[in-house]
C-alpha cells in the first residue's frame, strides 16, 4: 500500500533571467527512492537515478543544473518556462509518487513597474 505523500513548493514565481529551485519531498513512507524524474507535460527535463546518476535532457543542458539534493535548478528563465513541472518519484516497493509545481516567470521590468506605480 502507498502511504507516502509528496510535498512540493506548489505555485511559485520568478523573474525572467533569474533562476529557481524546483523541489519535491517524499514523506510518510519507508520506501526506497530509486529514481526521480523531473518532467514537463511534453518532455523529460532530467532524471536522477540511484545507479546511473543524473541525466539532463540535451535541450535543457545549458540552463538546468542538478540539485540541490533531488531537486532541480532552472537558470536563465524565460517567459516560455511558465507552466507545470512534475516530479515523479520511483520507489521500491511502493511504486510511483507524483508532485506538481506551477512556475510563473514574470517580466522583471513589469514587476518593477508594477511595484513603483501602485495606486494606493
Amino acid at each position: 500500500m502507498m502511504t507516502g505523500t509528496i510535498e512540493t513548493t506548489g505555485n511559485i514565481s520568478a523573474e525572467k533571467g533569474g533562476s529557481i529551485i524546483l523541489q519535491c519531498h517524499l514523506s510518510s513512507t519507508t520506501a526506497q527512492v530509486t529514481q526521480v524524474n523531473w518532467e514537463q507535460q511534453d518532455q523529460l527535463l532530467a532524471i536522477c537515478n540511484a545507479d546511473l546518476g543524473w541525466h539532463i535532457s540535451p535541450s535543457f543542458k545549458d540552463r538546468v543544473a542538478p540539485g540541490p539534493g533531488l531537486g532541480l535548478t532552472l537558470q536563465s528563465l524565460t517567459v516560455n518556462d511558465t507552466g507545470e513541472y512534475f516530479c515523479i518519484y520511483h520507489t521500491y516497493p511502493d511504486g510511483t509518487y507524483t508532485g506538481r509545481i506551477f512556475l510563473e516567470v514574470l517580466e522583471s521590468s513589469v514587476a518593477e513597474h508594477g511595484a513603483r506605480f501602485q495606486i494606493p
Epitope: E39, Q41, L44, T98
Partner: antibody
Framework: EVQLVQSGAEVKKPGATVKISCKVS????????IHWVQQAPGKGLEWMGY????????KYNVKFKGRVTITADTSTDTAYMELSSLRSEDTAVYYC??????????WGQGTLVTVSS | DIQMTQSPSSLSASVGDRVTITCKAS??????VAWYQQKPGKAPKLLIY???YRYTGVPSRFSGSGSGTDFTFTISSLQPEDIATYYC?????????FGAGTKLEIK
C-alpha cells in the same frame, strides 16, 4: 477504479468526419492528459495526440496533417477525438489512454472505425 | 522524432523458455522506455515503465533493462498466457513513438 469507456464502432464514407468519445471515471479528469492511439488492422500502435483537460492544451502527431482534433468536456469527464477527410487507410481501432504523463496504465476498450465507400 | 527499432518482429518459443526482445532508440532517451503486452482484440497493457519498473500487478517473470539507446525486455519463463504482441514505447518526449511490435508464439 479507473475506467475509460469509448463510444461504439463507426462506418464512414471517404471524405467524411468521425468523432469518438472517451468517458473517464475513477480519477480527477483534469489531473492527467488523455492520449489517442491508432492501430490499423494487423499493424502497430501510432500516437495521434493528446489533450490536457486542466487547461485545454493539445498536441498532435504531424502525420495526421491537421486532420485530427482532440477536445475535452470537463462537465462530463469526456474526451473526444475527431478525424476528418477520412480515407481507407484510416480504417483502424482507435484507443484513448491515460496514465503518468507519457506512459499509459489505462486504456479504453477501443473503437473500430471502418472507412468504406 | 525518436525512432524505436524493435527486434525480432516475431519469435517462437516453448513454455518455460527465457524470451528476450530488444528495442533501440534513435537517440538517447536515458531510461524513458515502456513495454506493453497486447492480446488479439484487446487494448495494450502496461508491463514496464522507465525501462525497468514493473507496473502494479505485473508478474515478476517480466522484466526490463537498459538505458541510453539500447533496451531489453525479458520473460524469464514463458507461460502459455504470455502469447501476445509486445511493444516498446519511448516516453522521453512528444511525439511519442512505439516499436513495430514483436509477435510471440508458442512452439
Amino acid at each position: 477504479e479507473v475506467q475509460l469507456v469509448q463510444s461504439g464502432a463507426e462506418v464512414k464514407k471517404p471524405g467524411a468526419t468521425v468523432k469518438i468519445s472517451c468517458k473517464v471515471s475513477g480519477y480527477t479528469f483534469t489531473d492527467h492528459t488523455i492520449h489517442w492511439v491508432q492501430q490499423a488492422p494487423g499493424k502497430g500502435l501510432e500516437w495521434m495526440g493528446y489533450i490536457y483537460p486542466r487547461d485545454g492544451s493539445s498536441k498532435y502527431n504531424v502525420k495526421f496533417k491537421g486532420r485530427v482534433t482532440i477536445t475535452a468536456d470537463t462537465s462530463t469527464d469526456t474526451a473526444y477525438m475527431e478525424l476528418s477527410s477520412l480515407r481507407s487507410e484510416d480504417t483502424a481501432v482507435y484507443y484513448c489512454a491515460t496514465g503518468m504523463l507519457r506512459w499509459f496504465a489505462y486504456w479504453g476498450q477501443g473503437t473500430l472505425v471502418t472507412v468504406s465507400s | 522524432d525518436i525512432q524505436m527499432t524493435q527486434s525480432p518482429s516475431s519469435l517462437s518459443a516453448s513454455v518455460g523458455d527465457r524470451v528476450t526482445i530488444t528495442c533501440k532508440a534513435s537517440q538517447d532517451v536515458f531510461t524513458a522506455v515502456a513495454w506493453y503486452q497486447q492480446k488479439p482484440g484487446k487494448a495494450p497493457k502496461l508491463l514496464i515503465y522507465s525501462a525497468s519498473y514493473r507496473y502494479t500487478g505485473v508478474p515478476s517473470r517480466f522484466s526490463g533493462s537498459g538505458s541510453g539507446t539500447d533496451f531489453t525486455f525479458t520473460i524469464s519463463s514463458l507461460q502459455p498466457e504470455d502469447i501476445a504482441t509486445y511493444y516498446c514505447q519511448q516516453h522521453y518526449s512528444i511525439p511519442l513513438t512505439f516499436g513495430a511490435g514483436t509477435k510471440l508464439e508458442i512452439k
